[in-house]
């Protein structure tokens, strides 16, 4: 059995209203029926109607239909507004424009091309002819009005009342002609109601063909009437759901208007060094998501491929690799340059409502001079002068005490990760504040990445580890417990210290963690002389975007032959290229009899920008990353590896040099693993040891 | 975020739904499932974390298992009952771990009869 | 376990007055209180999150106060619009967890 076409995408609805007849005349009939959809289905088919149906009446109340023979249009009738009541138009009697050959017009223009009136349809004067509305019922040959019967190319045409001129086309314009739209056409509430390849769309009221989430009810403010194209969600041009079952969407076919300017209403107010609401006006030049990730340009396709471009979005200001928000997303954002990480946003923004001053420092922040006192948990600073000993106690210089005023947030000690102030609560005894470099600022905190200036290896005799490794050289591997089973790796550097990665902290409950020390399988079966449990007391959280944690333990860990802690580098060292290192971890290993013992993968250093070329342009590494490839391919860090360490060989001394954390893939073949670089945060984790009380053995 | 799956099943057909991700990265946000029965209020399933570890309400325990891809969170019911017939949310998580959740899926219906 | 109590469970409130709801967690969560709205045959709404920070886009008519075990949202010059049922959600840890979310106010404007 065929399926009968829904044809109330034909129509176009006016809620709440309902025509009265006030010419006594004009006919109208009734029925009782469910739905609005069967009052549109007959009034198409004009099935038992003694007239051509152009309209229809839905009493959702008494669930009746009134067909009728006019519209809104038409002489003698008014609209009445009525809240049981919603009207329904055939879209062809009151469109004044074509869709592709105009077969479907029904409209009253009735001039030619070149302004001859038209001869009416049932008169044989001044031309004989063969198209009697008789002959040709359903194609609406009514008075003298353009018609296309047949289909036929050029559109609507008549027969001319000049006796001279049989027949002429009629200058009617297609609807894609008459239709246009500003900017990528949010703002469009325009009348196309089909797609660039023909097909009808579907209404934004019905659920069928296809189910969607622009519900009309749910967004007022998205001018979802009928079935019209319309741009909810900021695509490139309007849209719409097609009656197509195979084909979901596709984008209209609207050109954009001669005079491409925005109502007053559109424009979101802009700002260039804040953001305010959604950022959606946000024209500064900040250029890299808020971990530091540099921004990928609107205008390439790589590394990642989009339609975000600025010839699809004209209005948005997609220049060069800036955040923007062109699609009301929560903030502005951008494609990013890592090719495992495909948009991020740019959080780093202040908000415009948020500035404290001067909120931005240039370099690591060692002169900046705002009024900001606040730390980034909400923490009050405490006044310079009461804490002056503490200062002393880890700078080896004296501080500029006219820099130190009031309770403000300033870096004296300078230190590489901004501006700090201390707190007065012991638990936290200094914190950084929230303040962002200023935008365009690129200063390096450590210059020369890829030559080796300072060694990594704090003295070249300190200790010696002869022949293979054994489980005696792993005592300072750490499995991070979360509700009693292995979520993550650290490594033990300090007695009451374990360095990992935030993202092993899913909850803010330290009684749901605890740390296993000493032990070789992830569940301690055979480990129970040497195993050591240690509850956590705090989490120290790292520079903003370092991803690192320094993680405190409840006790000292008692070092022994099983447990032992890990050096750390030089601040700001370089480790050469082709160092040999490995990666520990109890985490995913691919096999399906995984026997829960700590394995290594064996990875040697690469330079930043080999780096990038192994990861084909896409990436590119900054300051605080390393970088390290597989000596076997697809060997290398994975889920369950995650804060584990990177650990590298130099003069004899073994350091933990990087941090394994989330978002680079798991062990990709031919792709070098990207680590935190533990170089660059050694003095942030020195100060850390040096400031914060940890409980006596 | 946008949910996909639901269906009406029998009780005890195994049933998977979907939550594709776009616009940001699961290597940045946790995901969770939330479930709403008509006329009820909203109950939190389970939630995947950046690192790839789950945690379930204790009546989910058992009940549900989510797992993930590079863009997708599912969420298995491996033997449905007709106490499972709800709208099914996902949302994404503030930040890698536990935290509110700052968007939301327009949900899928699931309905379990027999 | 941490989980949240909400009372009332239905409020009627004139145009223009101020709602008052609360939420309580079954042992401390610091902070970590988030508020939602939600209308019907719509997903819910991020209101407050950090039980008081309002989130992005939201009217200043809303408002969240506590910390510890006791919350509140507040709907001040309440508006027609303002009509749906509103949940608190914890944000802390969810350990042992039967539901994150509270059992919901609905808020009914007359």
């Known amino acids: 059995q065929r399926k009968r076409r829904n044809t109330i995408h034909e129509f176009k609805k006016s809620a709440k209203t309902t025509l009265i007849k006030i010419d006594p005349a004009l006919k109208i009939k009734t029925k009782k029926v469910n739905t609005a959809d069967q009052c549109a289905n007959r009034c198409t088919r004009n099935k038992g109607l003694p007239f051509t149906c152009k309209a229809f009446v839905f009493d959702k109340a008494r669930k009746q239909c009134l067909w009728f023979p006019f519209n809104s249009m038409s002489s003698g009738v008014k609209k009445e507004f009525g809240h049981e009541f919603d009207l329904y138009e055939n879209k062809d009697y009151i469109r004044n424009c074509i869709i592709g050959k105009g077969r479907s017009y029904k409209g009253t223009v009735s001039i030619t091309k070149s302004g001859i009136k038209c001869q009416p349809w049932s008169s044989m004067i001044p031309h004989e002819h063969s198209f009697l509305p008789s002959s040709y019922r359903g194609k609406d040959l009514q008075e003298n009005y353009c018609r296309n019967p047949r289909g036929e190319e050029g559109g609507p045409w008549c027969f001319t009342s000049n006796p001279e001129v049989r027949y002429e086309v009629c200058d009617i314009p297609q609807c894609s002609e008459v239709e246009c739209m500003t900017c990528n056409g949010e703002s469009y509430r325009g009348l196309m109601d089909h797609t660039e390849s023909g097909k009808i769309c579907q209404r934004w009221d019905h659920q069928t063909p296809h189910r969607h989430k622009f519900l009309p009810e749910r967004y007022p403010d998205k001018g979802f009437d009928d079935n019209y194209c319309r741009n909810p969600d900021g695509q490139p041009r309007p849209w719409c759901y097609t009656l197509d079952p195979h084909t979901r969407w596709e984008y209209c076919a609207i050109k954009t208007c001669a005079d491409n300017t925005m109502n007053d209403t559109d424009v979101p107010l802009e700002t260039t060094e804040c953001i305010q609401g959604q950022g959606e006006g946000y024209r500064g030049t900040v250029n890299t998501i808020w971990n530091g990730i540099p921004c990928q340009r609107w205008d390439s396709q790589y590394p990642h491929e989009h339609d975000m471009t600025p010839e699809n979005f004209k209005c948005k200001d997609l220049r060069e690799n800036y955040c923007r928000n062109p699609d009301g997303s929560e903030s502005p954002w951008c494609f990013t340059t890592d090719p495992n990480i495909r948009v991020g946003y740019c959080s780093q923004i202040p908000n415009c409502d948020m500035s404290h001053g001067q909120d931005c420092y240039r370099g690591n922040g060692k002169n900046y001079m705002g009024n900001l006192s606040q730390t980034r948990s909400g923490l009050t600073c405490s006044m310079w002068d009461k804490n002056m000993e503490d200062l002393h106690r880890h700078i080896f210089w004296e501080p500029d005490a006219s820099k130190l005023n009031e309770n403000y947030c300033r870096n004296p000690d300078d230190d590489a990760h901004g501006p700090w102030c201390y707190t007065g609560n012991p638990l936290i005894p200094w914190d950084y504040c929230p303040i962002s470099r200023c935008e365009g600022d690129t200063t390096p905190t450590i210059v020369n990445l890829d030559h080796p200036v300072i060694s990594c290896a704090k003295t070249k005799q300190l200790r010696v580890v002869n022949g293979i490794p054994t489980r005696t050289n792993i005592g300072w591997m750490v499995s991070l417990r979360y509700r009693n089973k292995h979520i993550c790796g650290g490594s033990l550097i300090k007695e009451s210290w374990v360095l990992t990665a935030r993202q092993c902290f899913p909850s803010r409950d330290l009684k749901d963690y605890e740390a296993w020390l000493g032990i070789h399988d992830v569940h301690g079966r055979g480990d129970e002389k040497c195993k050591q449990v240690l509850n956590v007391s705090q989490l120290v959280y790292g520079p903003e975007g370092s991803d690192l944690v320094l993680m405190k333990l409840a006790r000292p860990a008692v070092l022994d032959d099983f447990v032992s802690t890990i050096d750390l580098p030089n601040y700001g060292c370089t480790i050469p290229e082709k160092t040999s290192c490995s990666v520990y971890g109890w985490g995913y290993t691919g096999l399906i009899n995984y026997d829960g013992l700590l394995r290594v993968a064996h990875l040697y250093i690469m330079g930043n920008e080999k780096c990038s070329q192994h990861h084909r342009g896409k990436v590119t590494l900054n300051e605080s990353e390393i970088c390290a490839g597989a000596e076997k391919i697809g060997s290398g860090p994975c889920e369950g590896d995650y804060g584990g360490p990177l650990v590298c060989e130099q003069h004899k001394m073994r350091m933990v040099l990087g941090v394994i954390v989330p978002g680079r893939g798991c062990a990709i073949p031919n792709r070098p693993g990207i680590f935190v670089r533990v170089a660059y945060y050694a003095k942030w984790i020195h100060k850390i040891i040096l400031t914060y009380k940890v409980p006596q053995s | 975020v946008e949910e996909s799956g639901g269906r009406l099943v029998m009780p005890g057909t195994p049933l998977t739904l979907t939550c594709t991700v776009s616009g940001f990265s699961l290597s940045s946000n946790a995901i969770s499932w939330v479930r709403q029965a008509p006329e009820k209020g909203l109950e939190w399933i389970g939630v995947i974390y950046v690192i790839g570890v789950t945690d379930y309400a204790s009546w989910a325990q058992g009940r549900f298992t989510i797992s993930k891809t590079s863009t997708t969170v599912d969420l298995k019911i491996p033997s449905p009952t007709t106490e499972d017939t709800a709208t099914y949310f996902c949302?994404?998580?503030?930040?890698?771990?536990?935290?509110?959740?700052?968007?939301w899926g327009p949900g899928t219906l699931v309905t379990v009869s027999s | 376990a941490y989980d949240m109590t909400q009372t009332p469970a239905s409020v009627e409130v004139a145009v223009g007055g101020t709602v008052t709801i609360k939420c309580q967690a079954s042992?401390?969560?610091?902070?970590?209180l988030a508020w939602y709205q939600q209308k019907p045959g719509q997903p819910p709404k991020l209101l407050i999150y950090e039980a008081s920070k309002l989130a992005s886009g939201v009217p200043s008519r809303f408002s969240g106060s506590g910390s510890g075990t006791q919350f509140t949202l507040t709907i001040s010059g309440v508006e027609c619009a303002d009509a749906a049922t509103y949940y608190c959600q914890q944000a802390y840890s969810v350990a042992n967890v039967d539901n994150a979310f509270g059992g919901g106010t609905e808020v009914v404007v007359k």
């Open positions: 949302a994404r998580v503030y930040d890698s771990g536990w935290n509110h959740f700052n968007l």
């Open positions: 042992q401390s969560i610091s902070s970590w």
